[in-house]
Every structure is written in structure tokens, then in C-alpha cells.
């Protein structure tokens, strides 16, 4: 079959980092600078990505395979292949339309990137504060208040602080 | 092509006034949040300014909030920051940026940056 196929299509047999040249007789050409083909047949070349601005250069484009960008320090990526880049914010603010902005009382971040959330609300699970909440760092649920009572009979050891789920980005 | 191309930077003295262009192509500019960031010599790129599709929404980075004025003609497809009362600490070199799809609701992602135009404030 891959005989049949380049009888009848020469292009087929055109490697990556080449193009199939109508203008010359769909001889093979190499794709001209700055642009690549990652597959065999193929009869143009797409053009290299450039990482310019807050895009920075992790992989050159080659003749078979594009360029690959990453963000500069204080951004970081988004979407597939690093389609965009997104300012980092410091722990305890949130990234808005106006910039970085404090997380407001009762909620905290402890990344550079996402949403500010809200402290865990101890007592829906019976418990106590046991280290309040920052801009942050999540509160630290401790035993519920009942164990902290005289004369009970042993204390419950604190529960570790929840891991924070990370915001969909 | 997807493009940004930035003008209009230059030497100017302290106290004085400079306008930034950025005209685009290659994209429905209109559709888009469009963005102003700056990095000065040996600094991080800052965010300076933003803009929403039609222009009646924009914000800007305390350190010029009153000096400067970002705006929009979607007509000529262009981007401008108008810059009043500069200051040595202002010089850097200024970028446009096109926020990407859904800007300012799922994320604030810039996805198509501009080559960048120099500002200099200096007597």
C-alpha cells in the first residue's frame, strides 16, 4: 500500500523538515528558515512559533519540530503549550483586573497563582480554632471544644491543616 | 499574521508628556481586552494598564493611576497610552499585549505581545 501510495502521490515521500515543491516539479525542499514540518507529505512548511515579549525561548524551532515557549520570571503559563502567560501575584493576593490585590478577610492564598478561598470553618466539623487564618495560610483546626473541657478524659490530637485544592486555572 | 507593533517611545524630560501606539493585525482587535506592561532596566515586567473591548473599562497600576490614560480606536485598530508628568522611574521599555480568550472572567492570560518601544525620562 505505501508503494501504491507514492506512485501515486510523490509528496508522500518527502520527510519531515522538507515540503513538497509544486513550484518545482514537487521535488522535495527544505523548509526555508524559521519555519518546520513535524510529518512527512507535507506540502508547505507552518511557520516557527516566536516567544517575544513576556514569552521566553524554552526549545528552538527546528526544521522538524516548532519552537516551544515558557514565561518570564513573575508570570507563568496557561492553556496548552504555553498559549498564554499570566502574572504571578505574591502569596496572599489574587490576580484581578486591577492587578494584585490583598485577599480579603476570611480567605488566603498560599500560591502565587489562583484565587483567594475561604478559611476552613472548623466548627461545621465540630472543631476549634487552633492557629487562626492568615491572607496566607488556611486556619489550623484543633480539638472540638467539648475535648478542651475540664476533667475530659483524653484529647483528640490536632487534626492536620487541610491541603489547599488548587483553583482551576 | 497575529500582530502587535508599539511607537511612539522616545527621550523626554522629566515633567513631560509622551503618547505610545500599538496597532494590531491579523485579528478581530475589537474582541479583544488589550493590555500595557513595562520593564524597567534590570526589573520584572510590570503591569501598567488594561483595557476592555470597547474601551468604557479600563485600570492601571497605582504608580501611574491619574498620569496615564490607556484608550482604543477599533476603527484604525489601535491601542495608545497616553503618559503626562513623567518620572526617571518611568523609563522602561513599554509593551502592548492582547489578553487572550475570555480574559478577565476564567483567567488573566496575555497571549500575543508586541516587539516593545523604549521610554527614556531623563534631563
Known amino acids: 500500500f505505501e508503494r501504491t501510495r507514492s506512485l501515486q502521490d510523490p509528496c508522500s515521500n518527502c520527510p519531515a523538515g522538507t515540503f513538497c515543491d509544486n513550484n518545482r516539479n514537487q521535488i522535495c525542499s527544505p523548509c526555508p528558515p524559521n519555519s518546520f514540518s513535524s510529518a512527512g507529505g507535507q506540502r508547505t512548511c507552518d511557520i516557527c512559533r516566536q516567544c517575544k515579549g513576556v514569552f521566553r525561548t524554552r526549545k528552538e524551532c527546528s526544521s522538524t519540530s516548532n519552537a516551544e515557549c515558557d514565561c518570564t520570571p513573575g508570570f507563568h503559563c496557561l492553556g496548552a503549550g504555553c498559549s498564554m502567560c499570566e502574572q504571578d501575584c505574591k502569596q496572599g493576593q489574587e490576580l484581578t483586573k486591577k492587578g494584585c490585590k490583598d485577599c480579603c478577610f476570611g480567605t488566603f492564598n498560599d500560591q502565587k497563582r489562583g484565587i483567594c478561598r475561604p478559611w476552613t470553618n472548623c466548627s461545621l466539623d465540630g472543631k476549634s480554632v487552633l492557629v487562626n487564618g492568615t491572607k496566607e495560610r488556611d486556619v489550623v483546626c484543633g480539638p472540638s471544644p467539648a475535648d478542651l473541657s475540664p476533667g475530659a478524659s483524653s484529647v483528640t490530637p490536632p487534626a492536620p491543616a487541610r491541603e489547599p485544592g488548587h483553583s482551576p486555572q | 499574521e497575529v500582530q502587535l507593533v508599539e511607537s511612539g517611545g522616545g527621550l523626554v524630560q522629566p515633567g513631560g508628556s509622551l503618547r505610545l501606539s500599538c496597532g494590531a493585525s491579523g485579528f478581530t482587535f475589537s474582541s479583544y481586552w488589550m493590555l500595557w506592561f513595562r520593564q524597567a532596566p534590570g526589573k520584572e515586567l510590570e503591569w501598567v494598564a488594561n483595557v476592555n473591548q470597547d474601551g468604557s473599562e479600563n485600570y492601571y497600576v497605582d504608580s501611574v493611576e491619574g498620569r496615564f490614560t490607556i484608550s482604543r480606536d477599533n476603527a484604525k485598530n489601535s491601542l495608545y497610552l497616553q503618559m503626562h508628568s513623567l518620572r526617571a522611574e518611568d523609563t522602561a521599555v513599554y509593551y502592548c499585549?492582547?489578553?487572550?480568550?475570555?480574559?478577565?472572567?476564567?483567567?488573566?492570560?496575555?497571549?500575543?505581545w508586541g516587539q516593545g518601544t523604549m521610554v527614556t525620562v531623563s534631563s
Open positions: 499585549a492582547r489578553g487572550g480568550e475570555d480574559y478577565g472572567n476564567s483567567h488573566f492570560g496575555m497571549d500575543v
